[in-house]
């Protein structure tokens, strides 16, 4: 099969396009010439906002390590949104 496609059987009588993983899912195992893409759901703490045959789930941004706070929670399809910490006014 050509790149981006894989065999439908051991005899490889026909080829089909590699599957893409939807947003909220990431690639667990990249497709080969004989096997399709294996997708996995992005668990809490991870996200994927694209449909892709290559992209894995990515960890949410760690706001804390940037001295920021979470302004908007992440989901399996979106990263967290970080923002500045509220400063106490005198």
């Amino acid at each position: 099969c050509e790149e981006g496609w894989h065999c439908t059987s051991e005899a490889c009588e026909s080829c089909v396009l590699h599957r893409s993983c939807s947003p909220g899912f990431g690639v667990k195992q990249i497709a080969t010439g004989v096997s399709d893409t294996i997708c996995e759901p992005c668990p809490v703490g991870f996200f994927s906002n694209v449909s892709s045959a290559f992209e894995k789930c990515h960890p949410w941004t760690s706001c804390e390590t940037k001295d920021l706070v979470v302004q908007q929670a992440g989901t399996n399809k979106t990263d967290v949104v970080c923002g500045p910490q509220d400063r106490l006014r005198a």
Epitope: P43, G45, F46, E55, K56, H58, P59, T61, S62
Partner: antibody
Framework: EVQLQQSGPELVKPGASMKISCKAS????????MNWVKQSHGKKLEWIGL????????SYNQKFKDKATLTVDKSSSTAYMELLSLTTEDSAVYYC?????????WGQGTTLTVSG | DIVLTQSPTSLAVFLGQRATISCRAS??????????MHWYQQKPGQSPKPLIY???NLESGVPARFSGSGSGTDFTLNIHPVEEEDAATYYC?????????FGGGTKLEIK
């Protein structure tokens, strides 16, 4: 094929710090999440934390927040874990492991012995 | 943190028979149609080897005599028929939330 090659065994004194390395090959390093796992007494497995090699973002198990520091060097496709203020309780085998849900690929482990 | 309790801590099974290992979570690790429970095999001096992911999916290259089932808080790893090379310690692990946690392990001996 994904391969994770860890640094060799270490014997250190209490109070010291040390750094374990995990060199990745066979895949695009920045695209994969690297986890670190402690195994004490040849049995108990504990997740220490993870690092996103793409941007260096980390998430730690609260238990190890003041014990471990995770970093990466993208240019050499290497992940590092520094262990601080070592005590005999830190004697264990430490693994790097790649994965999001389960850990599909593991390093061979680095044995750390803390002894005075 | 989610606590995973494995039972039994050890078992001995005759060659060709069935080995059943249980893993119970302190709260549900299932949501949105997925069960975030995984299983590993570890032999002395080796790294853990992934067997089953998301409760029931076989990792690439793992023999079909291994199977996983369960949802919510109760999960099972079955090995049938057991072979000599299956003598090892087996661990469950969840990915329902951070931090990830592991079960205490079950040592399987083949008779």
């Amino acid at each position: 094929e994904v391969q994770l090659q860890q640094s060799g065994p270490e014997l250190v004194k209490p109070g010291a710090s040390m750094k374990i390395s995990c060199k990745a090959s066979g895949y695009s390093f920045a695209d994969y999440t690297m986890n670190w796992v402690k195994q004490s007494h040849g049995k108990k497995l504990e997740w220490i934390g993870l690092i996103n090699p793409y941007n260096g973002g980390t998430s730690y198990n609260q238990k190890f927040k003041d014990k471990a520091t995770l970093t990466v060097d993208k240019s050499s496709s290497t992940a590092y874990m520094e262990l601080l203020s070592l005590t005999t309780e830190d004697s264990a085998v430490y693994y790097c492991a790649e994965g999001v849900n389960n850990f599909a690929d593991w390093g061979q482990g680095t044995t750390l012995t803390v002894s005075g | 943190d989610i606590v995973l309790t494995q039972s039994p801590t050890s078992l001995a099974v005759f060659l060709g028979q069935r080995a059943t290992i249980s893993c119970r979570a302190s709260k549900s690790v299932s949501t949105s149609g997925y069960s975030y429970m995984h299983w590993y095999q570890q032999k002395p001096g080796q790294s853990p080897k992934p067997l089953i992911y998301l409760a029931s999916n076989l990792e690439s290259g793992v023999p079909a005599r291994f199977s996983g089932s369960g949802s919510g808080t109760d999960f099972t790893l079955n090995i049938h028929p057991v072979e000599e090379e299956d003598a090892a310690t087996y661990y469950c692990q969840h990915s329902r939330e951070l931090p990830r946690t592991f079960g205490g392990g079950t040592k399987l001996e083949i008779k």
